[in-house]
């Protein structure tokens, strides 16, 4: 059957057919964007909506981690008829809307990237006028942050039976390979631990037993560069202590 009705919200003549297109939004985001730590990245997001010429109030939102429930990192609101989206939230002041939501573009610029920004981001738009509707991308865009290695900690710690061990922790993306060098060692990839859960860019390497006094150097390397740091071991012979 075909029935004609007046749609009061848009004051248009509609034809309602027995099977009609569902009111659906669509969002276009790339699967991944890559950038180096310290640089800026653009997260593209465009959308289509089923509401012809919406000119009412709107809110643009970006969240991180997971869709619908992850923490918001950016939010702006545009008044009826306005093309200016006033920023209400920009986490650490590093997020800025590049796109124009009135033109179906929610693209976001992220400044001063850090490895901690490496996660998935989800764009969302909300209409709040005569039309009350909203949409959020389920897939999101993965921001892949790359970084040259940086040694974040190097230390010598006591072990049982008056022995000593050395630990070196570095961060980078891709995760760096760690190598120790030192007295009677040559180059050693000694006991590299897997990146710790929740710290995916950190890698730790341990030298389980330091047998000689002298300088021990940890080198971290990945495709973007290398970094090194050293510790010195001097044991007071005849005493149980050591100077590092």
């Amino acid at each position: 059957f075909v029935r004609t009705k007046i749609d009061t919200t848009e004051n248009l003549l509609n034809t309602e057919v027995h099977s009609s297109p569902a009111q659906r939004w669509s969002m276009q985001v790339p699967p991944e964007v890559s950038a180096e730590a310290g640089d800026a990245a653009v997260l593209p997001c465009t959308f289509t909506h089923p509401h012809r010429h919406y000119d009412g109030p709107l809110t643009a939102i970006w969240r991180a981690g997971e869709p619908y429930a992850g923490p918001q990192v950016f939010r702006c609101a545009a008044a009826r008829g306005s093309e200016l989206c006033q920023t209400a939230l920009s986490l650490h002041g590093r997020f800025r809307l590049l796109g124009n939501p009135r033109r179906n573009d929610l693209s976001l610029r992220v400044e001063r990237l850090a490895l901690a920004d490496d996660r998935r981001y989800f764009c969302r738009v909300e209409f709040a006028g005569d039309v009350h509707d909203r949409y959020e991308s389920r897939h999101g865009v993965r921001l892949h942050v790359t970084a040259a290695p940086r040694i974040v900690n190097i230390s010598v710690l006591p072990s049982p039976a008056h022995a000593f061990r050395a630990l070196c922790t570095a961060e980078g993306e891709p995760p760096p390979a760690l190598a120790w060098s030192g007295p009677a060692l040559g180059n050693s990839l000694a006991a590299v631990r897997s990146p710790r859960e929740g710290h995916g860019h950190l890698v730790t390497a341990e030298l389980p037993a330091l047998t000689h006094d002298g300088r021990y150097t940890c080198t971290a390397a990945n495709s973007l560069g290398r970094s090194e740091a050293s510790v010195y071991l001097f044991r007071f012979h005849g005493a149980s202590g050591a100077s590092t």
Epitope: S19, A22, S26
Partner: antibody
Amino acid sequence: DVQLQESGPGLVKPSQSLSLTCTVTGYSITSDFAWNWIRQFPGNKLEWMGYIRFSGSTTYKPTLKSRISITRDTSKNQFFLQLNSVTTEDSATYYCAREDYDGLFDYWGQGTTLTVTS
Amino acid sequence: DVLMTQTPLSLPVSLGDHASISCRSSQTILHSNGNTYLDWYLQKPGQSPKLLIYKVSNRFSGVPDRFSGSGSGTDFTLKISRVEAEDLGVYYCFQGSHVPYTFGGGTKLEIK
């Protein structure tokens, strides 16, 4: 975690009205999405009946439009199905389900069985 | 309404086999926004349906990668590589591109 739970009378007489409740926990029905009723007849055929959106607007299957109503109580985070003038053909297991923006039902209730008999 | 026709009605398999289920719609379910809202659900005895695949080929979270979906226009396929015991049940295709939304009649995956 999001959970949906249907409840209803189990038995209804022909020509009477059927009222079912879906109680949602772990998510506000006014936050997002469309909240649907779907039924499964003996023999396993599934039929989508309609939904109420987060905004309160409704969409129904055209062939049911004259006797279906989906409403909600936002204070209790519940939505309801009313089906008037039931016949034995309405005997089925009734499910409520959350429909996400991409047209997928990601959370379902466990279903409540309704028998229409005199 | 958009009629969704599934074949076969019943699909006897041995564990470890590949399985393929077909779903055909009576009209195109390509939405005007460019997406195709074709989903696959699995219903095990005594349970509600569970989502496997959405928008033709996207695996829902937690769904093993032995499930894959493909197709376009009016012809769609669900493939299961290496069937496991937990995969047994009734599979339904579903279209959400047109109102009213409609389900296929179901395909029962069972042990030979």
